[in-house]
């Protein structure tokens, strides 16, 4: 605790500081999302969103942030994703976002308002001052896990999984040694917060890294482990090999092609 106190005084943490223009970026993204990207959320007051966001971490010790701190923001940014349209991902962020860029009715967490606001940003404050720390922020490994960014993603990931319904898809990276990683946000948070009374199936898409690879990666031991976890929660599990991620890239370039519209 004394180490945290000293570090907070000199504000020298092991991670990079708050993203430049952080307040402006949040407001700009909020306006873009609510007015252009998803006009059905135009009722959202972006100034209120920023105030709630700010309130979650400003003047608070950046290693003592709780999920409770983000509840006012979650309440303001509450959003319903239609059943069968939730796409989770683990180590496939770029591919998952390319997919939802084309398949506009499908949502990753970063396609929801709160995820969109915070995507790729860093932020933290300083204990007992109203300043935003642009010099450094706590690193999850080097400093502490209860930092503003980590707690935010854990909180919104939990909520995103809890609100999912119908068939939920997850895009996994077949090139990784552990295709399903229990330590990832998907493995540690989302999997355990899918609601069996609302979600009847989790379908994993295992992305191969190119044509010519004919292995059945759905047989991977880590996938079998995922199947066991999901089945124990009374959710049906299924898994599909996706051999053609190259098609993502083609479709990202020409999304108007009818070959880029597929049902899931």
């Amino acid at each position: 605790v004394s180490r945290w106190h000293q570090q907070s005084q000199r504000s020298q943490w092991g991670g990079r500081g708050t993203t430049d223009r952080f307040p402006e970026i949040i407001l700009e993204r909020c306006v873009e999302y609510t007015q252009t990207l998803l006009p059905e959320m135009r009722h959202v007051d972006c100034q209120n969103i920023w105030d709630a966001f700010k309130g979650a971490f400003i003047s608070k010790h950046p290693c003592k942030i709780t999920e409770e701190d983000y509840q006012p923001l979650l309440k303001l940014g509450n959003q319903t994703v239609p059943c069968n349209k939730t796409l989770l991902w683990s180590r496939t962020k770029h591919l998952a976002h390319q997919y939802t860029e084309i398949q506009r009715d499908v949502f990753t967490l970063e396609d929801t308002l709160l995820g969109y606001l915070a995507d790729d940003l860093t932020w933290c404050g300083e204990f007992e001052t109203s300043e935003i720390n642009y010099r450094s922020c706590p690193d999850w490994r080097k400093d502490c896990s209860s930092n503003p960014v980590s707690v935010f993603w854990k909180t919104v990931s939990r909520r995103f999984a809890e609100s999912a319904c119908g068939v939920v898809h997850v895009m996994l990276n077949g090139s990784c040694s552990n295709i399903f990683d229990k330590k990832s946000t998907f493995g540690s948070v989302e999997v355990h917060n899918l609601q069996p009374e609302k979600v009847h199936t989790l379908e994993a898409w295992v992305m191969h890294d190119g044509r010519g690879d004919s292995r059945d990666l759905c047989q991977d031991p880590s996938i079998k482990e995922l199947e066991l976890i999901i089945s124990k929660r009374n959710i049906t599990f299924s898994c599909k090999n996706i051999y053609r991620p190259d098609k993502f890239l083609q479709c990202a370039k020409t999304p108007e092609d009818s070959s880029c519209i597929s049902k899931i």
């Epitope: 997919y99 084309i102 898409w205 191969h208 044509r211 010519g212 690879d213 004919s214 059945d216 759905c218 047989q219 299924s238 898994c239 599909k240 090999n241 996706i242 051999y243 053609r244 991620p245 190259d246 098609k247 993502f248 083609q250 479709c251 020409t254 092609d257 009818s258 070959s259 880029c260 519209i261 597929s262 049902k263 899931i264």
Partner: antibody, heavy 121, light 106 residues
């Protein structure tokens, strides 16, 4: 509407060559991967070869690798299959098929009527 | 490569349900499509991505896929459904089943 019309089939002796063409219309040809699928008389379907939308990647069944060459001319909306060192077992109706299915799955939504290739002495 | 096995023939009375199986090792791990082919004609896609019907295909055609078997189901089979049916999947290369001749009796 989508149309695929094959031509170039015929009778050829073993060891001979033949070039099949497939004229495409009714869609943006350069946006789609294309394939050749064949069907021997009274038999099932067999995938032969495929080519990416811009022609940069080509794929072949083991049975034709090194003998057949797939190519395309997007300016002419035409797909080709150059068949060399033909064998009796290459006798079949050859279909040109458009590869559909986006990023998650692969299938053939549109087929031509086929052109018959007979390899016999 | 995955091998897809279909029964050579299936018979069904008009109005009854026809089920055509396509078996393969863990075929449920792959998306399966189905084609209908009538004599002298090109194949026609009737099901893609396990269970999706292209526009223009009657609702009586449906598909499922899990475990080691994919199934094409034709409910209320009609005389015009008499044809050869092929399942197809992809695992780095396109693979077709051997085909099933569907006979509508009577």
């Amino acid at each position: 509407q989508v149309q695929l019309v094959e031509s170039g089939g015929g009778l050829v002796q073993p060891g001979g060559s033949l070039r099949l063409s497939c004229a495409a219309s009714g869609f943006t040809f350069s946006s789609y991967a294309m394939n050749w699928v064949r069907q021997a008389p009274g038999k099932g379907l067999e995938w032969v070869s495929g080519i990416s939308s811009w022609g940069s990647s080509t794929y072949y069944a083991d049975s034709v690798k090194g003998r057949f060459t797939i190519s395309r001319d997007n300016s002419k909306n035409t797909l080709y299959l150059q068949m060399n060192s033909l064998r009796a077992e290459d006798t079949a109706v050859y279909y040109c098929a458009r590869e559909d299915g986006s990023y998650m799955t692969d299938y053939f939504a549109y087929w031509g009527q086929g052109t018959l290739v007979t390899v016999s002495s | 490569d995955i091998e897809l096995t279909q029964p050579p023939s299936v018979s069904v009375a008009p109005g009854q349900t026809a089920r055509i199986s396509c078996s393969g090792d863990n075929i449920g791990h792959y998306y399966v499509s189905w084609y209908q082919q009538k004599p002298g004609q090109a194949p026609v896609l009737v099901i893609y991505s396990d269970s999706n019907r292209p526009s223009g295909i009657p609702e009586r055609f449906s598909g499922s896929n899990s475990g080691n078997t994919a199934t094409l189901t034709i409910s209320g089979t009609q005389a015009e459904d008499e044809a050869d049916y092929y399942c197809q999947s992809y695992n780095g290369t396109y693979v077709f089943g051997g085909g099933t001749k569907l006979t509508v009796l009577g």
